[in-house]
Amino acid sequence: GITIPRNPGCPNSEDKNFPRTVMVNLNIHNRNTNTNPKRSSDYYNRSTSPWNLHRNEDPERYPSVIWEAKCRHLGCINADGNVDYHMNSVPIQQEILVLRREPPHCPNSFRLEKILVSVGCTCVTPIVHHVA
Amino acid sequence: GITIPRNPGCPNSEDKNFPRTVMVNLNIHNRNTNTNPKRSSDYYNRSTSPWNLHRNEDPERYPSVIWEAKCRHLGCINADGNVDYHMNSVPIQQEILVLRREPPHCPNSFRLEKILVSVGCTCVTPIVHHVA
Protein backbone atom coordinates (compact mmCIF):
# COMPACT_ATOMS: atom_id res chain seq x y z
CA GLY A 1 0.00 0.00 0.00
CA ILE A 2 0.90 3.66 -0.11
CA THR A 3 2.45 5.09 3.07
CA ILE A 4 1.31 8.64 3.77
CA PRO A 5 3.44 10.81 6.07
CA ARG A 6 1.34 11.79 9.08
CA ASN A 7 0.31 15.45 9.26
CA PRO A 8 1.56 16.89 12.60
CA GLY A 9 -1.69 18.90 12.83
CA CYS A 10 -3.85 15.77 13.08
CA PRO A 11 -6.20 15.50 16.05
CA ASN A 12 -5.01 13.07 18.74
CA SER A 13 -7.10 10.04 19.48
CA GLU A 14 -7.18 8.67 23.00
CA ASP A 15 -9.79 6.11 21.97
CA LYS A 16 -8.64 2.64 23.00
CA ASN A 17 -9.95 1.25 19.68
CA PHE A 18 -7.79 3.62 17.61
CA PRO A 19 -7.31 3.38 14.66
CA ARG A 20 -10.57 1.40 14.30
CA THR A 21 -12.64 4.37 15.51
CA VAL A 22 -12.14 7.68 13.75
CA MET A 23 -13.63 11.17 13.82
CA VAL A 24 -15.80 12.07 10.83
CA ASN A 25 -17.05 15.55 9.96
CA LEU A 26 -20.59 15.21 8.60
CA ASN A 27 -20.51 18.56 6.75
CA ILE A 28 -20.62 16.94 3.33
CA HIS A 29 -18.31 18.28 0.67
CA ASN A 30 -19.93 17.84 -2.74
CA ARG A 31 -17.43 17.19 -5.53
CA ASN A 32 -20.12 16.97 -8.23
CA THR A 33 -19.77 20.50 -9.51
CA ASN A 34 -19.82 20.25 -13.31
CA THR A 35 -22.53 17.68 -13.80
CA ASN A 36 -26.00 18.30 -15.16
CA PRO A 37 -28.48 16.18 -13.17
CA LYS A 38 -31.07 16.50 -15.96
CA ARG A 39 -28.85 14.48 -18.25
CA SER A 40 -29.34 11.18 -16.52
CA SER A 41 -32.56 11.94 -14.68
CA ASP A 42 -34.84 10.13 -17.10
CA TYR A 43 -32.60 7.41 -18.47
CA TYR A 44 -34.70 5.02 -16.35
CA ASN A 45 -37.60 5.68 -18.75
CA ARG A 46 -35.72 5.93 -22.04
CA SER A 47 -33.48 2.90 -21.62
CA THR A 48 -34.07 -0.29 -23.60
CA SER A 49 -33.96 -1.89 -20.13
CA PRO A 50 -36.12 0.61 -18.22
CA TRP A 51 -36.40 0.56 -14.44
CA ASN A 52 -38.47 1.93 -11.59
CA LEU A 53 -36.94 3.59 -8.55
CA HIS A 54 -38.01 2.43 -5.10
CA ARG A 55 -37.42 4.45 -1.95
CA ASN A 56 -35.61 2.57 0.81
CA GLU A 57 -35.73 4.47 4.10
CA ASP A 58 -33.95 3.55 7.31
CA PRO A 59 -33.58 6.18 10.08
CA GLU A 60 -30.76 4.13 11.64
CA ARG A 61 -28.67 4.58 8.49
CA TYR A 62 -26.88 7.57 6.98
CA PRO A 63 -27.95 8.41 4.32
CA SER A 64 -31.40 7.42 5.56
CA VAL A 65 -32.93 7.36 2.06
CA ILE A 66 -31.50 5.25 -0.76
CA TRP A 67 -33.19 4.72 -4.12
CA GLU A 68 -33.19 1.16 -5.46
CA ALA A 69 -33.65 0.35 -9.14
CA LYS A 70 -35.98 -2.51 -10.13
CA CYS A 71 -35.96 -3.55 -13.81
CA ARG A 72 -39.41 -3.09 -15.33
CA HIS A 73 -39.28 -6.06 -17.69
CA LEU A 74 -37.55 -9.41 -17.99
CA GLY A 75 -36.71 -8.67 -21.62
CA CYS A 76 -35.54 -5.47 -23.31
CA ILE A 77 -37.47 -2.96 -25.39
CA ASN A 78 -36.88 -3.30 -29.13
CA ALA A 79 -37.09 -0.68 -31.89
CA ASP A 80 -40.87 -1.21 -32.19
CA GLY A 81 -41.39 -0.52 -28.49
CA ASN A 82 -42.15 -4.16 -27.70
CA VAL A 83 -40.42 -6.41 -25.17
CA ASP A 84 -37.85 -8.68 -26.81
CA TYR A 85 -37.44 -11.82 -24.72
CA HIS A 86 -34.26 -12.88 -26.51
CA MET A 87 -32.53 -10.27 -24.37
CA ASN A 88 -32.60 -9.70 -20.62
CA SER A 89 -32.94 -6.57 -18.48
CA VAL A 90 -30.58 -6.95 -15.53
CA PRO A 91 -29.76 -4.67 -12.59
CA ILE A 92 -26.35 -3.01 -12.36
CA GLN A 93 -25.34 -3.35 -8.75
CA GLN A 94 -22.79 -1.45 -6.73
CA GLU A 95 -21.40 -1.85 -3.24
CA ILE A 96 -21.62 1.41 -1.35
CA LEU A 97 -20.60 2.56 2.11
CA VAL A 98 -23.19 3.86 4.54
CA LEU A 99 -23.06 4.78 8.23
CA ARG A 100 -25.13 2.64 10.62
CA ARG A 101 -25.98 4.11 14.04
CA GLU A 102 -24.20 1.95 16.63
CA PRO A 103 -25.30 1.54 19.35
CA PRO A 104 -28.80 1.93 17.81
CA HIS A 105 -30.50 5.34 18.10
CA CYS A 106 -27.26 7.15 18.90
CA PRO A 107 -26.91 10.48 17.09
CA ASN A 108 -23.10 10.68 17.19
CA SER A 109 -21.80 7.14 16.95
CA PHE A 110 -21.75 5.05 13.79
CA ARG A 111 -20.23 1.99 12.19
CA LEU A 112 -19.31 1.73 8.51
CA GLU A 113 -21.50 -0.69 6.61
CA LYS A 114 -21.22 -2.02 3.09
CA ILE A 115 -24.49 -2.53 1.22
CA LEU A 116 -25.32 -3.63 -2.31
CA VAL A 117 -27.65 -1.35 -4.24
CA SER A 118 -29.14 -1.62 -7.73
CA VAL A 119 -28.41 1.64 -9.53
CA GLY A 120 -30.09 1.01 -12.87
CA CYS A 121 -30.60 -1.68 -15.48
CA THR A 122 -28.80 -2.70 -18.64
CA CYS A 123 -29.74 -5.01 -21.48
CA VAL A 124 -27.63 -8.16 -21.84
CA THR A 125 -27.39 -11.15 -24.11
CA PRO A 126 -28.24 -14.21 -22.03
CA ILE A 127 -25.74 -17.03 -21.78
CA VAL A 128 -27.59 -19.92 -23.33
CA HIS A 129 -27.17 -23.24 -21.53
CA HIS A 130 -28.65 -26.24 -23.32
CA VAL A 131 -29.82 -28.80 -20.79
CA ALA A 132 -28.94 -32.35 -21.80
CA GLY B 1 -38.55 13.40 9.81
CA ILE B 2 -38.60 10.49 12.22
CA THR B 3 -37.55 11.26 15.82
CA ILE B 4 -35.51 8.47 17.38
CA PRO B 5 -35.37 8.21 21.18
CA ARG B 6 -31.75 8.56 22.28
CA ASN B 7 -30.15 5.42 23.66
CA PRO B 8 -28.84 6.14 27.17
CA GLY B 9 -25.80 3.97 26.41
CA CYS B 10 -24.55 6.31 23.67
CA PRO B 11 -20.98 7.61 23.99
CA ASN B 12 -20.72 11.24 25.09
CA SER B 13 -19.22 13.75 22.76
CA GLU B 14 -17.21 16.63 24.15
CA ASP B 15 -16.32 17.77 20.67
CA LYS B 16 -17.23 21.44 20.27
CA ASN B 17 -18.48 20.75 16.75
CA PHE B 18 -20.96 18.11 17.90
CA PRO B 19 -23.19 16.94 16.23
CA ARG B 20 -21.19 17.80 13.10
CA THR B 21 -18.32 15.52 14.10
CA VAL B 22 -19.14 11.93 15.01
CA MET B 23 -17.28 8.75 15.92
CA VAL B 24 -17.22 6.06 13.25
CA ASN B 25 -16.10 2.47 13.71
CA LEU B 26 -14.22 1.40 10.58
CA ASN B 27 -14.76 -2.33 11.18
CA ILE B 28 -16.99 -2.69 8.15
CA HIS B 29 -20.12 -4.76 8.55
CA ASN B 30 -20.96 -6.38 5.21
CA ARG B 31 -24.70 -6.82 4.63
CA ASN B 32 -24.21 -8.44 1.20
CA THR B 33 -24.43 -12.03 2.33
CA ASN B 34 -26.67 -13.75 -0.19
CA THR B 35 -25.38 -12.27 -3.44
CA ASN B 36 -23.37 -14.06 -6.07
CA PRO B 37 -20.68 -11.65 -7.34
CA LYS B 38 -20.18 -13.79 -10.45
CA ARG B 39 -23.71 -13.00 -11.59
CA SER B 40 -23.07 -9.38 -12.47
CA SER B 41 -19.32 -9.60 -13.00
CA ASP B 42 -19.56 -9.97 -16.77
CA TYR B 43 -22.51 -7.72 -17.56
CA TYR B 44 -19.97 -5.11 -18.69
CA ASN B 45 -19.09 -7.39 -21.60
CA ARG B 46 -22.51 -8.83 -22.40
CA SER B 47 -24.49 -5.60 -22.34
CA THR B 48 -25.76 -3.98 -25.54
CA SER B 49 -24.04 -0.90 -24.10
CA PRO B 50 -20.78 -2.53 -22.91
CA TRP B 51 -18.31 -0.71 -20.70
CA ASN B 52 -14.74 -0.87 -19.44
CA LEU B 53 -13.86 -0.47 -15.78
CA HIS B 54 -11.15 2.00 -14.83
CA ARG B 55 -9.40 1.98 -11.49
CA ASN B 56 -9.48 5.31 -9.64
CA GLU B 57 -7.09 5.32 -6.70
CA ASP B 58 -6.72 8.04 -4.08
CA PRO B 59 -4.92 7.28 -0.80
CA GLU B 60 -6.54 10.33 0.82
CA ARG B 61 -9.98 8.77 0.31
CA TYR B 62 -11.73 5.84 1.93
CA PRO B 63 -12.32 3.59 0.07
CA SER B 64 -9.07 4.41 -1.70
CA VAL B 65 -9.99 2.40 -4.82
CA ILE B 66 -13.16 3.05 -6.81
CA TRP B 67 -13.94 1.47 -10.18
CA GLU B 68 -15.38 3.81 -12.82
CA ALA B 69 -17.35 2.57 -15.83
CA LYS B 70 -16.61 4.06 -19.25
CA CYS B 71 -18.99 3.17 -22.08
CA ARG B 72 -17.11 1.39 -24.85
CA HIS B 73 -19.10 2.75 -27.80
CA LEU B 74 -21.20 5.76 -28.69
CA GLY B 75 -23.97 3.59 -30.09
CA CYS B 76 -25.40 0.29 -28.85
CA ILE B 77 -24.70 -3.25 -30.05
CA ASN B 78 -27.49 -4.70 -32.18
CA ALA B 79 -28.52 -8.33 -32.71
CA ASP B 80 -25.87 -8.75 -35.44
CA GLY B 81 -23.11 -7.60 -33.12
CA ASN B 82 -22.71 -4.27 -34.92
CA VAL B 83 -22.99 -0.78 -33.47
CA ASP B 84 -26.42 0.77 -34.05
CA TYR B 85 -26.04 4.53 -34.33
CA HIS B 86 -29.72 5.24 -33.72
CA MET B 87 -29.22 4.42 -30.05
CA ASN B 88 -26.71 5.78 -27.53
CA SER B 89 -24.67 4.09 -24.78
CA VAL B 90 -24.85 6.31 -21.70
CA PRO B 91 -23.33 5.96 -18.22
CA ILE B 92 -25.58 5.27 -15.24
CA GLN B 93 -24.26 7.54 -12.52
CA GLN B 94 -24.73 7.41 -8.78
CA GLU B 95 -23.81 9.73 -5.97
CA ILE B 96 -21.93 7.87 -3.26
CA LEU B 97 -20.46 8.83 0.09
CA VAL B 98 -16.76 8.44 0.74
CA LEU B 99 -14.48 9.54 3.58
CA ARG B 100 -11.82 12.14 2.77
CA ARG B 101 -8.85 12.49 5.15
CA GLU B 102 -9.09 15.93 6.70
CA PRO B 103 -6.68 17.44 7.55
CA PRO B 104 -4.80 15.67 4.72
CA HIS B 105 -2.67 12.63 5.62
CA CYS B 106 -4.42 12.14 8.96
CA PRO B 107 -5.12 8.49 9.74
CA ASN B 108 -7.99 9.08 12.18
CA SER B 109 -9.83 12.18 10.99
CA PHE B 110 -12.14 12.33 7.99
CA ARG B 111 -14.85 14.38 6.32
CA LEU B 112 -17.80 12.94 4.45
CA GLU B 113 -17.65 13.63 0.73
CA LYS B 114 -20.23 13.05 -1.99
CA ILE B 115 -18.86 11.95 -5.36
CA LEU B 116 -20.52 10.95 -8.62
CA VAL B 117 -19.44 7.62 -10.06
CA SER B 118 -20.39 5.84 -13.27
CA VAL B 119 -21.47 2.34 -12.33
CA GLY B 120 -22.23 0.89 -15.76
CA CYS B 121 -23.87 1.80 -19.04
CA THR B 122 -27.35 1.49 -20.49
CA CYS B 123 -28.76 1.94 -23.97
CA VAL B 124 -31.14 4.87 -24.51
CA THR B 125 -33.11 6.62 -27.21
CA PRO B 126 -32.12 10.31 -27.40
CA ILE B 127 -35.08 12.67 -26.97
CA VAL B 128 -35.00 14.82 -30.10
CA HIS B 129 -32.57 16.24 -32.58
CA HIS B 130 -30.88 19.63 -32.72
CA VAL B 131 -32.27 22.16 -30.27
CA ALA B 132 -32.12 25.76 -31.44
Epitope: - | L74, Y85, P126, H129, H130
Partner: antibody, heavy 123, light 107 residues
Protein backbone atom coordinates in the same frame (compact mmCIF):
# COMPACT_ATOMS: atom_id res chain seq x y z
CA UNK C 1 -20.70 30.75 -29.95
CA UNK C 2 -19.49 27.24 -30.73
CA UNK C 3 -16.04 27.21 -32.33
CA UNK C 4 -13.81 24.31 -33.37
CA UNK C 5 -10.27 25.36 -34.28
CA UNK C 6 -8.04 22.76 -35.91
CA UNK C 7 -4.25 22.55 -36.13
CA UNK C 8 -2.42 23.61 -39.28
CA UNK C 9 -1.63 21.77 -42.50
CA UNK C 10 0.83 18.85 -42.37
CA UNK C 11 3.12 17.32 -44.95
CA UNK C 12 4.29 13.79 -44.09
CA UNK C 13 6.34 11.00 -45.62
CA UNK C 14 4.75 7.60 -46.31
CA UNK C 15 4.88 5.36 -43.23
CA UNK C 16 4.90 8.28 -40.80
CA UNK C 17 2.13 9.29 -38.38
CA UNK C 18 0.29 12.55 -37.93
CA UNK C 19 -1.80 13.91 -35.04
CA UNK C 20 -4.41 16.57 -35.77
CA UNK C 21 -5.91 18.61 -32.93
CA UNK C 22 -9.29 20.30 -32.58
CA UNK C 23 -9.74 22.90 -29.83
CA UNK C 24 -13.36 23.46 -28.82
CA UNK C 25 -14.88 26.56 -27.23
CA UNK C 26 -18.29 28.10 -26.67
CA UNK C 27 -19.88 25.03 -25.08
CA UNK C 28 -19.24 22.41 -22.38
CA UNK C 29 -16.74 20.13 -24.11
CA UNK C 30 -17.54 17.05 -21.99
CA UNK C 31 -21.23 17.11 -22.85
CA UNK C 32 -21.00 16.59 -26.62
CA UNK C 33 -19.37 13.99 -28.81
CA UNK C 34 -16.64 14.84 -31.31
CA UNK C 35 -16.48 13.27 -34.77
CA UNK C 36 -13.90 13.24 -37.53
CA UNK C 37 -14.68 13.32 -41.26
CA UNK C 38 -12.29 12.80 -44.18
CA UNK C 39 -12.61 14.61 -47.51
CA UNK C 40 -10.16 13.29 -50.08
CA UNK C 41 -9.76 15.17 -53.36
CA UNK C 42 -12.67 14.33 -55.68
CA UNK C 43 -14.16 11.88 -53.14
CA UNK C 44 -17.30 12.01 -51.04
CA UNK C 45 -17.13 12.93 -47.36
CA UNK C 46 -16.29 9.91 -45.22
CA UNK C 47 -17.15 9.60 -41.54
CA UNK C 48 -14.14 8.20 -39.66
CA UNK C 49 -15.48 7.90 -36.13
CA UNK C 50 -16.59 9.72 -33.01
CA UNK C 51 -15.65 9.93 -29.35
CA UNK C 52 -17.53 10.81 -26.17
CA UNK C 53 -15.20 12.97 -24.02
CA UNK C 54 -17.21 12.16 -20.90
CA UNK C 55 -17.23 8.36 -21.08
CA UNK C 56 -14.29 7.78 -23.41
CA UNK C 57 -16.60 5.72 -25.64
CA UNK C 58 -15.46 5.56 -29.26
CA UNK C 59 -17.10 4.34 -32.46
CA UNK C 60 -15.08 3.91 -35.64
CA UNK C 61 -16.02 3.42 -39.26
CA UNK C 62 -14.70 -0.09 -40.09
CA UNK C 63 -12.56 1.44 -42.87
CA UNK C 64 -10.59 3.44 -40.29
CA UNK C 65 -10.08 0.84 -37.57
CA UNK C 66 -6.34 0.48 -37.10
CA UNK C 67 -5.71 3.59 -39.20
CA UNK C 68 -7.16 6.34 -37.01
CA UNK C 69 -7.06 6.75 -33.23
CA UNK C 70 -9.37 9.24 -31.55
CA UNK C 71 -8.54 10.72 -28.14
CA UNK C 72 -9.46 13.76 -26.06
CA UNK C 73 -7.86 15.96 -23.42
CA UNK C 74 -10.86 17.18 -21.45
CA UNK C 75 -8.81 19.61 -19.37
CA UNK C 76 -7.80 21.39 -22.58
CA UNK C 77 -11.18 20.95 -24.34
CA UNK C 78 -9.27 19.41 -27.22
CA UNK C 79 -9.91 16.37 -29.40
CA UNK C 80 -7.19 14.57 -31.33
CA UNK C 81 -7.15 12.33 -34.37
CA UNK C 82 -3.98 10.37 -35.10
CA UNK C 83 -3.35 8.63 -38.42
CA UNK C 84 -0.68 5.94 -38.54
CA UNK C 85 1.28 4.26 -41.36
CA UNK C 86 0.48 7.07 -43.75
CA UNK C 87 0.02 6.33 -47.45
CA UNK C 88 -0.73 8.57 -50.43
CA UNK C 89 -4.45 7.75 -50.18
CA UNK C 90 -4.51 9.38 -46.74
CA UNK C 91 -3.95 12.74 -48.44
CA UNK C 92 -7.10 14.68 -47.63
CA UNK C 93 -8.72 17.43 -45.62
CA UNK C 94 -9.74 16.17 -42.17
CA UNK C 95 -12.55 17.84 -40.27
CA UNK C 96 -13.53 17.60 -36.64
CA UNK C 97 -17.25 18.10 -36.06
CA UNK C 98 -19.37 18.34 -32.93
CA UNK C 99 -21.95 15.61 -32.42
CA UNK C 100 -24.92 15.40 -30.08
CA UNK C 101 -25.05 15.03 -26.31
CA UNK C 102 -26.90 11.70 -26.14
CA UNK C 103 -29.66 13.40 -24.17
CA UNK C 104 -31.39 16.06 -26.26
CA UNK C 105 -29.62 14.99 -29.42
CA UNK C 106 -28.24 11.74 -30.75
CA UNK C 107 -24.48 11.34 -30.35
CA UNK C 108 -24.26 11.01 -34.14
CA UNK C 109 -26.03 14.27 -35.08
CA UNK C 110 -23.28 16.53 -36.40
CA UNK C 111 -23.91 20.27 -36.26
CA UNK C 112 -20.72 22.39 -36.02
CA UNK C 113 -17.53 21.76 -38.01
CA UNK C 114 -13.90 22.80 -37.67
CA UNK C 115 -12.19 24.63 -40.54
CA UNK C 116 -10.38 21.48 -41.70
CA UNK C 117 -6.75 20.36 -41.66
CA UNK C 118 -4.99 19.39 -44.88
CA UNK C 119 -2.73 16.36 -44.57
CA UNK C 120 -0.47 15.69 -47.55
CA UNK C 121 1.42 12.41 -47.80
CA UNK C 122 4.28 12.61 -50.24
CA UNK C 123 7.73 11.10 -50.57
CA UNK D 1 -23.71 -0.22 -45.87
CA UNK D 2 -26.34 2.21 -47.13
CA UNK D 3 -25.25 4.06 -50.26
CA UNK D 4 -26.67 7.52 -50.91
CA UNK D 5 -26.86 8.64 -54.55
CA UNK D 6 -27.45 12.31 -55.28
CA UNK D 7 -28.83 13.74 -58.50
CA UNK D 8 -28.17 15.63 -60.57
CA UNK D 9 -24.39 15.71 -60.24
CA UNK D 10 -24.42 19.37 -61.31
CA UNK D 11 -27.37 21.75 -61.40
CA UNK D 12 -27.08 25.04 -63.31
CA UNK D 13 -29.62 27.68 -62.31
CA UNK D 14 -29.96 31.43 -62.01
CA UNK D 15 -30.57 33.47 -58.85
CA UNK D 16 -34.27 33.69 -58.08
CA UNK D 17 -34.99 30.23 -59.50
CA UNK D 18 -36.14 27.18 -57.55
CA UNK D 19 -33.65 24.36 -56.97
CA UNK D 20 -34.65 20.73 -56.31
CA UNK D 21 -31.90 18.34 -55.23
CA UNK D 22 -32.51 14.60 -54.85
CA UNK D 23 -30.96 11.99 -52.56
CA UNK D 24 -31.79 8.31 -53.01
CA UNK D 25 -30.79 5.60 -50.52
CA UNK D 26 -29.93 2.01 -51.46
CA UNK D 27 -32.23 0.86 -48.63
CA UNK D 28 -34.80 2.50 -46.40
CA UNK D 29 -33.49 5.21 -44.06
CA UNK D 30 -35.33 6.52 -41.00
CA UNK D 31 -36.14 10.16 -41.76
CA UNK D 32 -35.02 11.06 -38.23
CA UNK D 33 -31.47 10.31 -39.29
CA UNK D 34 -31.16 12.07 -42.64
CA UNK D 35 -29.43 15.46 -42.91
CA UNK D 36 -28.35 17.93 -45.60
CA UNK D 37 -25.14 20.00 -45.60
CA UNK D 38 -23.90 22.89 -47.71
CA UNK D 39 -20.20 23.30 -48.53
CA UNK D 40 -18.56 26.27 -50.21
CA UNK D 41 -15.02 26.09 -51.70
CA UNK D 42 -12.33 26.13 -49.01
CA UNK D 43 -14.90 25.98 -46.22
CA UNK D 44 -16.23 23.32 -43.88
CA UNK D 45 -19.68 21.83 -44.46
CA UNK D 46 -22.59 23.60 -42.75
CA UNK D 47 -25.67 21.85 -41.42
CA UNK D 48 -28.87 22.92 -43.21
CA UNK D 49 -31.50 20.28 -42.49
CA UNK D 50 -31.71 17.48 -39.92
CA UNK D 51 -34.38 14.84 -39.40
CA UNK D 52 -35.11 15.08 -43.18
CA UNK D 53 -37.21 18.24 -42.78
CA UNK D 54 -36.14 20.36 -39.77
CA UNK D 55 -34.10 23.48 -40.42
CA UNK D 56 -30.97 23.94 -38.33
CA UNK D 57 -30.41 27.08 -36.26
CA UNK D 58 -29.94 30.20 -38.40
CA UNK D 59 -30.89 28.58 -41.71
CA UNK D 60 -33.20 30.76 -43.89
CA UNK D 61 -36.69 29.43 -44.55
CA UNK D 62 -36.07 29.24 -48.30
CA UNK D 63 -34.36 25.91 -47.52
CA UNK D 64 -36.69 22.97 -46.94
CA UNK D 65 -36.32 19.21 -46.80
CA UNK D 66 -38.82 16.43 -47.43
CA UNK D 67 -39.07 12.73 -48.14
CA UNK D 68 -39.07 9.35 -46.42
CA UNK D 69 -37.95 5.77 -46.96
CA UNK D 70 -35.44 5.86 -49.81
CA UNK D 71 -36.23 9.20 -51.49
CA UNK D 72 -35.36 12.58 -50.00
CA UNK D 73 -35.38 16.08 -51.45
CA UNK D 74 -33.76 19.40 -50.59
CA UNK D 75 -35.57 22.40 -52.05
CA UNK D 76 -34.31 25.98 -52.23
CA UNK D 77 -37.39 28.03 -53.09
CA UNK D 78 -35.67 31.12 -54.46
CA UNK D 79 -31.93 31.01 -55.07
CA UNK D 80 -29.71 33.72 -53.62
CA UNK D 81 -26.16 34.33 -54.92
CA UNK D 82 -24.70 32.83 -51.68
CA UNK D 83 -26.56 29.55 -52.22
CA UNK D 84 -24.30 28.37 -55.04
CA UNK D 85 -22.23 25.60 -53.46
CA UNK D 86 -22.01 21.80 -53.15
CA UNK D 87 -24.82 20.05 -51.21
CA UNK D 88 -24.45 16.71 -49.46
CA UNK D 89 -27.06 14.41 -47.95
CA UNK D 90 -26.00 12.19 -45.03
CA UNK D 91 -27.56 9.32 -43.07
CA UNK D 92 -26.68 7.13 -40.13
CA UNK D 93 -28.05 3.92 -38.69
CA UNK D 94 -26.16 0.68 -39.15
CA UNK D 95 -23.64 2.74 -41.12
CA UNK D 96 -22.78 6.42 -41.45
CA UNK D 97 -22.58 7.69 -45.01
CA UNK D 98 -22.68 10.81 -47.20
CA UNK D 99 -23.90 11.22 -50.76
CA UNK D 100 -21.38 12.14 -53.44
CA UNK D 101 -22.73 15.70 -53.60
CA UNK D 102 -24.63 17.93 -56.01
CA UNK D 103 -22.86 21.01 -57.31
CA UNK D 104 -25.22 23.95 -57.65
CA UNK D 105 -23.67 26.45 -60.06
CA UNK D 106 -24.71 29.78 -61.53
CA UNK D 107 -26.11 29.44 -65.04
Amino acid sequence: QVQLVQSGAEVKKPGASVKVSCKASGYTFNEYTMHWVKQAPGQRLEWMGGINPNSGGVSYNQNFKGKATLTVDTSASTAYMELSSLRSEDTAVYYCARGGDGYYTNYFDIDYWGQGTTVTVSS
Amino acid sequence: EIVLTQSPGTLSLSPGERATLSCRASQSVSSSYLAWYQQKPGQAPRLLIYGASSRATGIPDRFSGSGSGTDFTLTISRLEPEDFAVYYCQQYGSSYTFGQGTKLEIK
